[in-house]
Interface confidence: low
């Protein structure tokens, strides 16, 4: 009687585009064939997948967020066959370039400014807002009531993923009109994908440089 196999992993929380993952079908058994399934389908050909040790070891050479699985392995001999319980990888990734919504760049004086920032990331990233280079708050949503022309400026959302050690940012130039009609969206919006606060500041400088020369 074959034992029920199980999958061991050298890394259950791999980082996207950085880590390789080795999945091993246990136990070692004589005169046994090893099989693998991903997402309930037979393993399909991919240059990032590598089978070794008589198909007992499956290596994902460079994981992506689509490689979560589930993975199952099976063992068979001439008399019986057994399949493992599924194993899911927790692939850490991101944060992707954030998106600030709504996309509006121009507001009337006296309106409320309610900006939301979102970035695809696992685990969820830490969010920070900077206005004209000054850190304001660590929240996903930035709310300012009854804005005035004093609230003109570069609004940067900064996202950080402690698991991947990566961060990212985007900057939007918001203009507040004091007149009755809102101006057209003439303010420039620049987005930057960077690795730290310096990138936000640099993007913010570019924003202001363009804004003041138009």
């Amino acid at each position: 009687e074959l034992p029920k196999p199980y999958i061991s992993s050298n890394n259950s929380n791999p980082i996207e585009d950085k880590d390789a993952v080795t999945l091993t079908c246990e136990p070692v058994a004589e005169n046994t064939t090893y099989l693998w399934w991903v997402n309930n389908q037979s393993l399909s050909v991919s240059p990032r997948l590598q089978l070794s040790n008589g198909n007992r070891i499956l290596t994902l050479l460079s994981v992506t967020r689509n490689d979560t699985g589930p993975y199952e392995c099976g063992i068979q001999n001439s008399e019986s066959a057994k399949r493992s319980d599924p194993v899911t990888l927790n692939v850490t990734y991101g944060p992707d370039t954030p998106i600030i919504s709504p996309p509006d760049l121009s507001y009337r004086s006296g309106a409320n400014l309610n900006l939301s920032c979102h970035s695809d990331s696992n685990p969820s990233p830490q969010y920070s807002w900077l206005i004209n280079g000054t850190l304001r708050q660590h929240t996903q949503v930035l709310f300012i009531s009854k804005i005035t022309s004093n609230n003109n400026g570069a609004y940067a959302c900064f996202v950080s993923n402690l698991a991947t050690g990566r961060n990212n940012s985007i900057v939007k130039n918001i203009s507040v009109s004091s007149g009755d009609s809102a101006p057209g969206s003439s303010g420039l919006s620049a987005s930057g994908s960077g690795s730290g606060l310096n990138d936000i500041f640099e993007a913010q400088k570019i924003e202001w440089h363009h804004h003041h020369h138009h």
Epitope: L35, W37, Q41, S42, L43, V45, L51, N55, G74, A81
Partner: antibody, heavy 120, light 107 residues
Framework: ELQLVESGGVLVKPGGSLKLSCAAS????????MSWVRQTPEKRLEWVTY????????YYPDTVKGRFTISRDNARNTLYLQMSSLKSEDTAIYYC?????????????WGQGTLVTVSA | DIQMTQSPASLSASVGETVTITCRAS??????LAWYQQKQGKSPQLLVY???TLTEGVPSRFSGSGSGTQFSLKINSLQPEDFGSYYC?????????FGSGTKLEIK
Amino acid sequence: ELQLVESGGVLVKPGGSLKLSCAASGFAFSSYDMSWVRQTPEKRLEWVTYINSGGGITYYPDTVKGRFTISRDNARNTLYLQMSSLKSEDTAIYYCTAHYFGSSGPFAYWGQGTLVTVSA
Amino acid sequence: DIQMTQSPASLSASVGETVTITCRASENIYSYLAWYQQKQGKSPQLLVYNAKTLTEGVPSRFSGSGSGTQFSLKINSLQPEDFGSYYCQHHYGTPFTFGSGTKLEIK
């Protein structure tokens, strides 16, 4: 004794429809992934479609996708193949097969086949 | 799709001889290869799977070998019941594809 018995093969006109059945006995049908495989008059073997043991996963090659539908009734130990928009190139002996081990397994058990002829 | 190229298309041999049939996959299929035997008027029968594992009841004069893209089926000391057609097939996920077959005839 494990048995797979196909039925339903007849002469049909191009564009017509047909439903094949495969009655399984002598094994735990509901535990096996199943496929239909056909053999052309030129003796070439072609995989036609696959269904997993529970019936929730099906696969088709491009040659039959959208025209053929595989299904199963585990309570009745029966596999089905609904064929529509039949073409002359679908003429073949159709075999009901059981996979040896899940979707990665080869075709371990074969029925005797049923002949489908598509001709005007 | 993975293409399976089988050779030779036909083969004549005498009882007692040793013959080898080869199969080449267009892509790496590791060891996910099966061999089938089909006698005139009968259904195919699985001989070998995972490139070299013999199905229960298959005589030891049959042996499969190879991995990756190159595979072979060897029959030692041919017996009268071994004559018929042989097909290779990959079982490395769908779509499953077969070789075009090798007809083994008595010389």
